[in-house]
């Protein structure tokens, strides 16, 4: 077609090949590129930079080849608009470096960088690791040192070559509802670029005030609530080697609380409960006012919670085979250093076979049961019984 003689020729239904020498200095606004999956560029000495918006609109792109061209800079966010990119060939260009951020978030199956004057520096440690660990098909020549020719420098042994070290300092004292909490994020490392807090989990748990800058960032949590418990406060930092982040959780103390539900028959009987408090409260059951000693017939069983970001725990007082001797008043006492709470519920599992009308015949096969016992049984179940 006539258009092919200009700059780029279509290849199949979703490919584009741009090989006419010296006709491209940018990839921005390639015509008909909407459903492009393959782009091949060659012999474009004026194509020197690949910037953030250059590949906008190429959301379906799977394979990008830019070879034997003048590419000397690829922006860290150059592939932001091509998340499906899996094959990247930038061989035989003028690249001296390539940021780890450029390929972050991509699922590359192969990356070819051979024929570039890559300079050995901390910024290429990620690439060396990819090669060593076979993380994807990485093809480069030996990295060039500042000295003579092609030489491979063991970057990993260079102690100054590493991701930042991030530490968060927290208050040692216990934190209570309504307190203000100051956290400090200390960052160490070479060529630090940026750092910040990630506070997405904290919305509604406190007012947040950021302060300071690299290498020490401050965060004040004002008027904290108990909802802050189990929420991650994260500090991250980046340099040319990579990114590091660390998370902490602020423990906000508050008194125990407890709620009981009516006994329900599941595969066994369950008196459902919910307890809250920080630190996690200790629990004690009482039956008709006396301490209930747990056995494999009557015991506390916590429910596995999918929510790991809350302090409230749910569970059952599990009763296997309860009979009339288990009928009565059940009380759950929850206590922590900040307070205690109790809740009670009446439960009836079975009628007492010994409450009979004087007119009725006496059931001879029955003998008296110790009515003080709390470890007697219950009711058939259909599932595995602890």
């Amino acid at each position: 077609a006539a258009s092919c003689r200009e700059t780029c020729c279509p290849v199949g239904p979703s490919g584009l090949r741009c090989t006419r020498a010296g006709t491209l200095n940018t990839l921005r606004g390639l015509r008909g590129a909407g459903n492009l999956t393959e782009l091949y560029v060659e012999n474009q000495r004026d194509l020197q930079r690949l910037e953030f918006e250059d590949l906008q609109g190429l959301g379906e792109l799977r394979s990008l080849t830019i070879v034997k061209s003048g590419l000397r800079f690829v922006a860290p966010d150059a592939f932001h608009f091509t998340p499906r990119l899996s094959h990247l060939n930038l061989s035989s260009n003028a690249l001296e470096s390539l940021s780890w951020k450029t390929v972050q978030g991509l699922s590359l199956q192969d990356l070819t960088l051979s024929g570039n004057p890559l300079h050995c520096s901390c910024a290429l440690l990620w690439l060396q690791r990819w090669e060593q660990e076979d993380l994807c098909g990485v093809y480069t020549q030996k990295l060039q040192g500042s000295g003579s020719g092609d030489q491979f420098l063991p970057l990993g042994h260079n102690n100054s070559c590493g991701v930042p070290s991030v530490k968060i300092q927290m208050p040692n004292d216990s934190v209570e509802v309504g307190d203000d909490v100051f956290l400090q994020c200390q960052v160490e490392g070479q060529a630090l670029q940026q750092a910040d807090w990630i506070l997405t989990e904290l919305e509604g748990t406190a007012t947040m005030k950021k302060s300071g800058d690299l290498p020490s960032l401050g965060l004040t949590l004002v008027n904290v609530t108990s909802d802050l418990n189990k929420k991650n406060v994260t500090c991250w930092a980046e340099n040319d080697v990579g990114r590091a982040e660390v998370s902490v959780q602020v423990s906000v103390s508050f008194p125990a609380s407890v709620h009981l539900g009516k006994a329900v028959e599941q595969h066994h009987w369950c008196i459902p409960f919910s307890v809250d408090g920080q630190p996690a409260p200790s629990l004690r059951w009482f039956f008709n006012g006396s301490v209930l000693n747990e056995t494999s017939f009557i015991f506390t069983q916590f429910l596995e919670s999918a929510l790991t970001n809350e302090t409230m725990r749910h569970g059952c007082l599990r009763l296997n085979q309860p009979t009339h001797v288990n009928n009565g008043n059940y009380t759950l006492l929850a206590a922590n250093p900040y307070g205690q709470a109790a809740a009670s519920i009446m439960a009836a599992f079975m009628d007492n076979p010994f409450e009979f009308n004087p007119e009725d015949p006496i059931p001879v096969s029955f003998s008296p049961v110790d009515t003080n016992s709390t470890s007697r049984d219950p009711v058939e179940k259909k599932d595995e019984t602890p």
Partner: antibody
Framework: QVQLQQPGAELVKPGASVKLSCKAS????????MHWVKQRPGQGLEWIGE????????NYDEKFKTKATLTIDKSSRTAYIQLSSLTSEDSAVYYC???????????WGQGTLVTVSA | DIQMTQSPASLSATVGETVTITCRAS??????VAWYQQKQGKSPQLLVH???TLAEGVPSRFSGSGSGTQFSLKINGLHPEDFGSYYC?????????FGAGTKLELK
């Protein structure tokens, strides 16, 4: 499938102690109490006690309160019974067992034969 | 503690015969009885729980009955593999107790 693995045998001297293991697999270890049962050669079965792997809570038959100590290692999914001050009366097979669908022992270990001999 | 009194202590029978083993509890235990079979040098195997419910995989020639304090295990038409020891056990709270056992031998 549910498995309770126990070593085959232990030879111990009178007055010594021994710690027997029972490694569980094939079910949620912390959800089911582990029980221990003793059987002397040619004799019947005696329930020693039970332990809740979730919190280490134990109950013993009165007869074994000073003889046996039940413990749990959650990380290795293993239950233990320690028998102290051993005498010839303690020579027996010791089984670990757990309930199945109902409150009855549907699953047993192979048992460990403890022989107390000078 | 609940005592479980099992009888007979031993029993001789032939293949094809029907036998019954009984167990008496020292107090009302509703239907909370289990029965086990044990072969020489092996672990016990659950046959029956809740007095009459057969455990998974147990042949239908085994049957349990009773409630309150009187319980029995019946084997209808003995097979060669049925010989061994049998134990009853209450599962009505702790401490759990077993009967002394019945040794079923080939006549």
């Amino acid at each position: 499938q549910v498995q309770l693995q126990q070593p085959g045998a232990e030879l111990v001297k009178p007055g010594a102690s021994v710690k027997l293991s029972c490694k569980a697999s094939g079910y949620t270890f912390t959800s089911y109490w582990m029980h221990w049962v003793k059987q002397r050669p040619g004799q019947g079965l005696e329930w020693i006690g039970e332990i809740n792997p979730n919190n280490g809570l134990t109950n013993y038959d009165e007869k074994f309160k000073t003889k046996a100590t039940l413990t749990i290692d959650k990380s290795s999914r293993t239950a233990y019974i320690q028998l102290s001050s051993l005498t010839s009366e303690d020579s027996a097979v010791y089984y670990c067992a757990k309930y199945g669908n109902y409150v009855a022992f549907a699953f047993w270990g192979q048992g460990t034969l403890v022989t107390v001999s000078a | 503690d609940i005592q479980m009194t099992q009888s007979p202590a031993s029993l001789s029978a032939t293949v094809g015969e029907t036998v019954t083993i009984t167990c008496r509890a020292s107090e009302n235990i509703y239907s909370y009885v289990a029965w086990y079979q044990q072969k020489q040098g092996k672990s016990p195997q659950l046959l029956v729980h809740n007095a009459k419910t057969l455990a998974e995989g147990v042949p239908s020639r085994f049957s349990g009955s009773g409630s309150g304090t009187q319980f029995s295990l019946k084997i209808n038409g003995l097979h060669p593999e049925d010989f061994g020891s049998y134990y009853c056990q209450h599962h009505y709270g702790i401490p759990l107790t077993f009967g002394a056992g019945t040794k079923l031998e080939l006549k």
